[in-house]
Interface confidence: medium
């Protein structure tokens, strides 16, 4: 993939990969980064209670509604 692909996808994204199977109770803080010029996708960074920071999949069922509320200001998205 050439530089055009980088412009389309990576740009300056925070998350290179996401971690699966994280229990919500392990999360102490959640940061949601909207799509923007810096990155072409929504990114979710979770601070865990053990001090680690990981990236989560915004499509994960337990996150979807939370992210919709954050991104859409209470508007219900499809």
């Amino acid at each position: 993939a050439g530089p055009a692909a980088a412009v389309l996808r990576e740009l300056r994204c925070v998350c290179l990969q996401t971690t699966q199977g994280v229990h919500p109770k392990m999360i102490s803080n959640l940061q949601v980064f909207a799509i923007g010029p810096q990155c072409s996708k929504v990114e979710v960074v979770a601070s865990l209670k053990n001090g680690k920071e990981i990236c989560l999949d915004p499509e994960a069922p337990f996150l979807k509604k939370v992210i919709q509320k954050i991104l859409d200001g209470g508007n219900k998205e499809n």
Partner: antibody
Framework: QVQLQQSGAELVRPGTSVTISCKAS????????IVWVKQRPGHGLEWIGD????????FYSENFKGKATLTADTSSSTAYMHLISLTSEDSAVYFC????????????WGQGSLVTVSS | DIKMTQSPSSMSASLGERVTITCQAS??????LSWYQQKPWKSPKTLIY???RLADGVPSRFSGSGSGQDYSLTISSLESDDTATYYC?????????FGAGTKLELK
């Protein structure tokens, strides 16, 4: 729910220009990309370009540079596509669509705007 | 530009039949592939994204698979409402490009 309402059909003369609008509702306009797609009978679907209104950021297909200009009015949550120097080749249905959580797919589509270029 | 070769261009199938449509990219698109259904005089409807994920509200009879250059859309049991034209879209590299479409009709 998410809705993209496009402007109505246009009959325009060759050599003139036209502006198509796409009014978004049901979500925060500045948090997603708006893409524009052209469809001509027998030619399938063709990506024109996309726009991130939160930062006035646009990408265009090489085929549409100098033909299409994408803009947005965030106060009314409306995206616009302006087409210039129209010829019969520009006669088509034009769709706007909204990205999903990733710019790389189109989650919601407008109903389409038919542009007919004829003298 | 990446070329998307979609096949077949048209097909007919019976109710309840399993239907598969394929798309081949001219290079690796890393699963940045989505599928859209379009009925005459209507706008496209999103079915599948990231090659395998089902869009909201899409019946579970639709599924997507594939990786690298080769992808497919499967309808496990065809229903009358599924008669339409289906398009694949790669968005792995700019510009995004669509397949030419597969027109699916009932036998």
């Amino acid at each position: 729910q998410v809705q993209l309402q496009q402007s109505g059909a246009e009959l325009v003369r060759p050599g003139t220009s036209v502006t198509i609008s796409c009014k978004a509702s049901g979500y925060t306009f500045t948090n997603y990309w708006i893409v524009w797609v052209k469809q001509r009978p027998g030619h399938g679907l063709e990506w024109i370009g996309d726009l991130y209104s939160g930062g006035g950021y646009t990408f265009y297909s090489e085929n549409f540079k100098g033909k299409a200009t994408l803009t947005a009015d965030t106060s009314s949550s409306t995206a616009y596509m302006h087409l210039i120097s129209l010829t019969s080749e520009d006669s088509a249905v034009y769709f706007c669509a909204r990205s999903g959580y990733d710019r790389t797919w189109f989650a919601h589509w407008g109903q389409g705007s038919l542009v007919t270029v004829s003298s | 530009d990446i070329k998307m070769t979609q096949s077949p261009s048209s097909m007919s199938a019976s109710l309840g039949e399993r239907v598969t449509i394929t798309c081949q990219a001219s290079q690796d698109i890393e699963s940045y592939l989505s599928w859209y259904q379009q009925k005459p005089w209507k706008s496209p409807k999103t079915l599948i994204y990231y090659a395998t994920r089902l869009a909201d509200g899409v019946p579970s009879r639709f599924s997507g698979s594939g990786s690298g250059q080769d992808y497919s859309l499967t309808i496990s049991s065809l229903e009358s409402d599924d008669t339409a034209t289906y398009y694949c879209l790669q968005h792995g590299e700019s510009p995004p490009t669509f397949g030419a479409g597969t027109k699916l009709e009932l036998k």
